[in-house]
């Protein structure tokens, strides 16, 4: 079947990095500069993505793969393939439409992105607060009050785990 298809369609022989040039009797021509084809048998090459402004080049375009962008310092990627760059805030802040805003009391954000979230209410999960929350850190929940025997020595809690961070996929 593959052989038959190749006889019928000469374009199927054109590898990635080339295109099937109708103007030249369906000869496989290399992709022109600043373009690529990531699969074989293509009749055109795609224009390379350009990483400009707040975007910076993470991976250069080649004849077989598109360029990849990330964001300049102070910004982070959003969307599939880093389609946008969004301003970083400090820990203890959230990005609103009016810019970075401090977390209100009772909320925290330990990332440079995302929202201020309410501290975990340990009692709802039958636990007690081991370490109080701050603008930058959630509370640390420990055993339920009933599990702590009177006079038990205080336990030094582990450092709070890093909140989920979303690195560009």
């Amino acid at each position: 079947f593959e052989r038959t298809r190749s006889l019928q369609d000469p374009c199927s022989n054109c590898p990635a990095g080339t295109f099937c040039d109708n103007n030249r009797n369906q000869i496989c021509s290399p992709c022109p500069p600043n373009s690529f084809s990531s699969a074989g048998g293509q009749r055109t090459c795609d224009i390379c993505r350009q990483c400009k402004g707040v975007f910076r080049t993470r991976k250069e375009c080649s004849s077989t793969s598109n360029a990849e962008c990330d964001c300049t310092p102070g910004f982070h990627c959003l969307g599939a393939g880093c389609s946008m760059c969004e301003q970083d805030c400090k820990q203890g802040q959230e990005l609103t439409k009016k810019g970075c805003k401090d977390c209100c009391f009772g909320t925290f954000n330990d990332q440079k992105r995302g929202i201020c979230r309410p501290w975990t209410n340990c009692s709802l999960d039958g636990k007690s607060v081991l370490v109080n929350g701050t603008k930058e850190r959630d509370v640390v929940c420990g055993p339920s009050p009933a599990d702590l025997s009177p006079g038990a020595s205080s336990v030094t809690p582990p450092a709070p785990a890093r909140e989920p961070g979303h690195s560009p996929q």
Epitope: G79, A161, R162
Partner: antibody, heavy 120, light 106 residues
Framework: QMQLVQSGAEVKKPGASVKVSCKAS????????MHWVRQAPGQGLEWMGW????????NYAQKFQGRVTITRDTSASTAYMELSSLRSEDTAVYYC?????????????WGQGTLVTVSS | SYELTQPPSVSVAPGKTARITCGGN??????VHWYQQKPGQAPVLVIY???DRPSGIPERFSGSNSGNTATLTISRVEAGDEADYYC?????????FGGGTQLTVL
């Protein structure tokens, strides 16, 4: 391929508890908050709460506080939602949903849903 | 608590433009996300952060948000767009959904 696969349908009696699981694949469970949303027959979407799979920190909608517990097992890449003291009004499809990256908290991937029927 | 109001239903002829609104107090200051849900299926994110489209969502879907109203616009409506649509915001300590709008393609 990013996927959230939930456990199968459940039939429960009033007063009982139900525990629904949500297994993540194609990404690291610890990387994103996980939410639970339910939908009663013919009704809209209702948010129940989230878990930070990294630390185990939770936040529950006021309506469900005291009845819902969201947990996770990172080694199994699975989040769980347990609802207790079930009543007929809890009959619904329960969804897990991954929090996305947008400003203001979006839910970018959803499980297929688990139908929980509460009937005597 | 914060409330989002959507019309229960919107009807539109194929090829025309559908507009679904989502009302909320000063909603323009919040980020609005929109979900499409077809019968028997899980919701799908179609617009996030007011107007951005996830990969795989057609350009026919667009969003806007200002004042007290956010709007999901579907241009050149197709039969396959028939579904329920929900708006959603984050409000200080909870995720809030609108009541949903059933889009009927005539």
């Amino acid at each position: 391929q990013m996927q959230l696969v939930q456990s199968g349908a459940e039939v429960k009696k009033p007063g009982a508890s139900v525990k629904v699981s949500c297994k993540a694949s194609g990404y690291s469970l610890e990387g994103y908050y996980m939410h639970w949303v339910r939908q009663a027959p013919g009704q809209g979407l209702e948010w129940m709460g989230w878990i930070n799979p990294n630390s185990g920190g939770t936040n529950y909608a006021q309506k469900f506080q005291g009845r819902v517990t969201i947990t996770r097992d990172t080694s199994a890449s699975t989040a769980y939602m347990e609802l207790s003291s079930l009543r007929s009004e809890d009959t619904a499809v329960y969804y897990c949903a991954r929090e996305g990256e947008a400003v203001g908290l979006d839910l970018d991937y959803w499980g297929q849903g688990t139908l929980v029927t509460v009937s005597s | 608590s914060y409330e989002l109001t959507q019309p229960p239903s919107v009807s539109v002829a194929p090829g025309k433009t559908a507009r679904i609104t989502c009302g909320g107090n000063n909603i323009g200051s919040k980020s609005v996300h929109w979900y499409q849900q077809k019968p028997g299926q899980a919701p799908v994110l179609v617009i996030y952060y007011d107007s951005d489209r996830p990969s795989g969502i057609p350009e026919r879907f667009s969003g806007s948000n200002s004042g007290n109203t956010a709007t999901l616009t579907i241009s050149r409506v197709e039969a396959g767009d028939e579904a329920d649509y929900y708006c959603q915001v984050w409000d200080s300590s909870s995720v809030v959904f609108g009541g949903g709008t059933q889009l009927t393609v005539l």
